[in-house]
């Protein structure tokens, strides 16, 4: 029978044994930085090359007994999960192992850095096909380890890491907190976050997605044909490394940004029970469980977007938060969110030649998040058009006036502490899709993009208050690029995109005592690329 | 040569105390620093430390990903090391664990 985890990552309508061919991932090399491994285990023999790299600290304790099978346990299991002949994800992927963890599973930041440097030098000396680096380890937040991961990622290497097993915010750990790394949390057979003793999988905005990580059957170093079940975010990361190898083998030219977007796009959505996460982390944690794409052929015709949350701004009056897209992604819209509702909106601004999304805290606010919508839009030319506060009763509006530019997102930002709920609601005049409309005391920012074949439309869903949440989704074939609230008044906590749905959250009116019957409207901008669709059809 | 004006090198260490490994430090140099400059900076640190009666050991010189070096030394020398030319920041080594 097929292990639950391989069944889970197989797309619907396929059988795992049919879907995972013996040569899957064969064009890809996966580097594993872990313990020593038993490379002649039947699951992985001939698939794993043990490099001569070793940089580990001495084991703790005077009575430590170095038993080979224990020393090899973690790494052997993970190598089996990635490429094992029976229980592996990418059965055709070849692997190279570096020993950076000792027999107790402990290593150092410096040893890991030297290991990453070794990989980079190997890549320069003998360039091969796509490289995936699996880092099934975690330490405290490390600026230098994150920086090294960033450099390696910018050299075209895909890094996949464990989110950590501390039932904590993954942003407090490295390399999990490195934005360029694909950070993986763990779920179980019931699609619940994995509990590990008193702890469990990490969570939060630094996690990219989850993958099976409990009771995972894989190679055991106890004997050359033994199997064992292990659990942890390492096992989850190994699944994603295997899926990445499969995807890169099918499309070797994929960039890191394209691969990450595909991993997110093909994941199972909204299956994780978020109640397991601390309340303040639920909105930040992606509800995604990794899966293989339904076809080994590319999905190049899709317009892929993902949501990137900033770190929390902190509570000071002038505090801001910045969310950034990856280097080869376009920022198509920017929104903000505050649990207290005290915020001064958000704006898109240039920083180092690239657009970023900045959210502003308000006096008495507990802090804000900036939320960027980051998309893959080849040959795009995007700019931000701003209208200052109109002060007129009809509100502030701005549109994309350049020929061929379409509206992909709207933001609003205000200097006053409270826009007030008594102002008349501002509704968008119909038939003007290329226009952002906002409160008269707010500056309005429109993201306007020109890209071959790009077309966008505005979708709205308004319901009278009191209503804690209003949503509007883009239909099949369209991708959500922009998500904002109308009007941007103070009882609106903010707006953010979850997959292809725009979510607008408002304060619970029963607690605020407000009697305003003001309607809250969720405004989604949905786009698609005819150009990408045509290019894909021509290839097929 | 002194560090460039207005760019003070910073010191970082693990927020989780039991995971800290004091006595080993990663000295990260500014982005465009060449290997020869990294080696020179490491030697300079050793020389200045020796003049103060401290023994240091260069464990590794980084190049390829980040310019810098790994050094075994007393924490007393951090102030001195932060003032070296080309230094961007220094991070105390720390533990990582299988997950």
């Amino acid at each position: 029978s097929i292990p639950w985890n391989l069944e889970r990552i197989t797309p619907p309508r396929y059988r795992a044994d049919e879907y995972q061919p013996p040569d899957g991932g064969s064009l890809v090399e996966v580097y594993l930085l872990d313990t020593s491994i038993q490379s002649d285990h039947r699951e992985i023999e001939g698939r794993v090359m043990v490099t001569d790299f070793e940089n580990v600290p001495e084991e703790d304790g005077t009575r430590f007994h170095r038993q080979a099978s224990k020393c090899d346990s973690h790494g052997t299991h993970l190598a089996g999960v990635v490429s094992g002949r029976d229980a592996g994800v990418a059965k055709g992927a070849s692997m190279r192992s570096l020993r950076v963890l000792n027999c107790q599973g402990k290593g150092t930041v410096s040893g890991t850095l030297i290991g990453l440097e070794f990989i980079r030098k190997s890549q320069l000396v003998q360039p091969v096909g796509p490289l995936v680096v699996l880092l099934p380890l975690a330490g405290g937040y490390s600026r230098v380890l994150n920086a090294a991961c960033q450099r390696l990622a910018r050299a075209g290497v895909v890094l996949v890491t464990a989110a950590g097993n501390f039932r904590d915010d993954a942003c407090l750990y490295s390399p999990a907190s490195a934005p360029e790394v694909i950070t993986v949390g763990a779920t179980n057979a019931q699609d619940q976050p994995v509990t590990l003793g008193t702890l469990g999988t990490n969570f939060g905005r630094c996690v990219d997605l989850f993958a099976p990580g409990e009771d995972i059957i894989g190679a055991s170093s106890d004997c050359s044909t033994c199997f064992v079940s292990q659990s942890g975010t390492s096992q989850a990361a190994a699944h994603v490394a295997g899926i990445a190898a499969m995807m890169l083998s099918a499309e070797p030219e994929l960039t890191l940004a394209e691969l990450r977007q595909r991993l997110i796009h093909f994941s199972a959505k909204d299956v994780i029970n978020e109640a397991w996460f601390p309340e303040d982390q639920r909105v930040l944690t992606p509800n995604l469980v990794a899966a293989l794409p339904p076809s080994t052929h590319g999905a190049g015709w899709q317009l892929f977007c993902r949501t990137v949350w900033s770190a929390h701004s902190g509570p000071t009056r002038m505090a801001t938060a910045i969310a950034r897209c990856a280097p080869d992604e376009e920022l198509l819209s920017c929104s903000s969110f505050s649990r207290s509702g005290k915020r001064r909106g958000e704006r898109m601004e240039a920083q180092g030649g690239k657009l970023v999304c900045r959210a502003h805290n308000a006096f008495g606010g507990e802090g804000v998040y900036a939320i960027a919508r980051c998309c893959l839009l080849p040959q795009a030319n995007c700019s931000v058009h701003t209208a200052p506060p109109a002060e007129a009763s009809m509100g502030t509006r701005v549109h994309c006036h350049q020929q061929g530019h379409v509206l992909t997102g709207c933001s609003s930002h205000w200097e006053v502490e409270d826009l007030g709920t008594h102002k008349p609601p501002v509704l968008r005049p119909r038939g003007q899709p290329n226009q952002c409309v906002g409160h008269r005391e707010a500056s309005i920012h429109a993201s306007c993009c020109h890209a071959p074949g790009l077309e966008c439309k505005v979708k709205e869903h308004g319901i009278p208050a009191p209503q804690e949440q209003v949503t509007v989704a883009c239909e099949e074939g369209w991708t959500l690029t922009g998500c904002s609230a109308l009007p941007g008044t103070s009882h609106v906590l903010g707006a953010y995109a979850v997959d292809n749905t725009c979510v607008v959250r408002s304060r619970d009116v029963s607690t605020t005592g407000s009697t305003s019957e003001e309607a809250v409207t969720a405004v989604a901008i949905c786009c698609r690329s005819r150009h990408l669709a045509q290019a894909s059809q021509e290839l097929q | 040569e002194a560090p460039e004006h207005g760019t003070t090198a910073t010191f970082h260490r693990c927020a989780k105390d039991p995971w800290r490994l004091p006595g080993t430090y990663v000295v990260v140099l500014k982005e465009e620093t060449h290997l020869s400059q990294s080696e020179r900076t490491a030697r300079r640190l050793q020389a200045q430390a020796a003049r103060r009666g401290y023994l240091t050991k260069i464990l590794h010189v980084f190049h390829g990903l980040l310019p810098g070096f790994l050094v075994k030394m007393s924490g007393d020398l951090l102030e001195l090391a932060l003032k070296l030319p080309h230094v961007d920041y220094i991070e105390e080594d720390s533990s990582v664990f299988a997950q």
């Epitope: 044994d17 490379s39 002649d40 001939g46 043990v50 002949r85 004997c223 050359s224 | -």
Partner: antibody
Framework: QVQLVQSGAEVKKPGASVKVSCKAS????????ISWVRQAPGQGLEWMGW????????NYAQKLQGRGTMTTDPSTSTAYMELRSLRSDDTAVYYC????????WGQGTTVTVSS | DIQMTQSPSSLSASVGDRVTITCRAS??????LDWYQQKPGKAPKLLIY???TRPSGVPSRFSGSGSGTDFTLTISSLQPEDFATYYC?????????FGQGTKVEIK
Amino acid sequence: QVQLVQSGAEVKKPGASVKVSCKASGYTLNNYGISWVRQAPGQGLEWMGWVSFYNGNTNYAQKLQGRGTMTTDPSTSTAYMELRSLRSDDTAVYYCARGYVMDIWGQGTTVTVSS
Amino acid sequence: DIQMTQSPSSLSASVGDRVTITCRASQSINNWLDWYQQKPGKAPKLLIYAASTRPSGVPSRFSGSGSGTDFTLTISSLQPEDFATYYCQQDQDIPPTFGQGTKVEIK
């Protein structure tokens, strides 16, 4: 290139022991164990067991019933298969092969058990 | 142990013929089936692994197919050097077990 070179033919009396060697070269030893397979005259192939160069672990076919011992000496890149209490039906060509996949084979060692 | 049954046990064919040998497992072995070629006085040589994958250096006239319990080795156009005995071997379980062999002779 990758190759396995076995020791020469042996003639043994019933009850005696034989030790066949297999020297591996051209690949990283630790990445593969060595399988031993035998073929009686005019018969098919029979897997006898597997031994690790990495840690000396073994995996024997039940039929050997404790009569066989497989070992490795990584320092000389050599694997050994010893068969004790030889019987006439142990007369066969003994092959070593790389790993469980058995993708590379030695040239074979003929062991004749005869009184 | 898993039993492997090959058919036919021998066959006569001419150069250029298309030859098919079948192998049946006593239980499902997924795609874990290998084919070997053995010439008199020589060691077996791996021809096909994982039911259908050809190692580098094996001519493309050799192909394998099947999954579960039924497998086939096909030689699309028999060459003089292909006259030999062919063995199938299951690689699903330990111990690996071989078929009894199919001898391909010159007609």
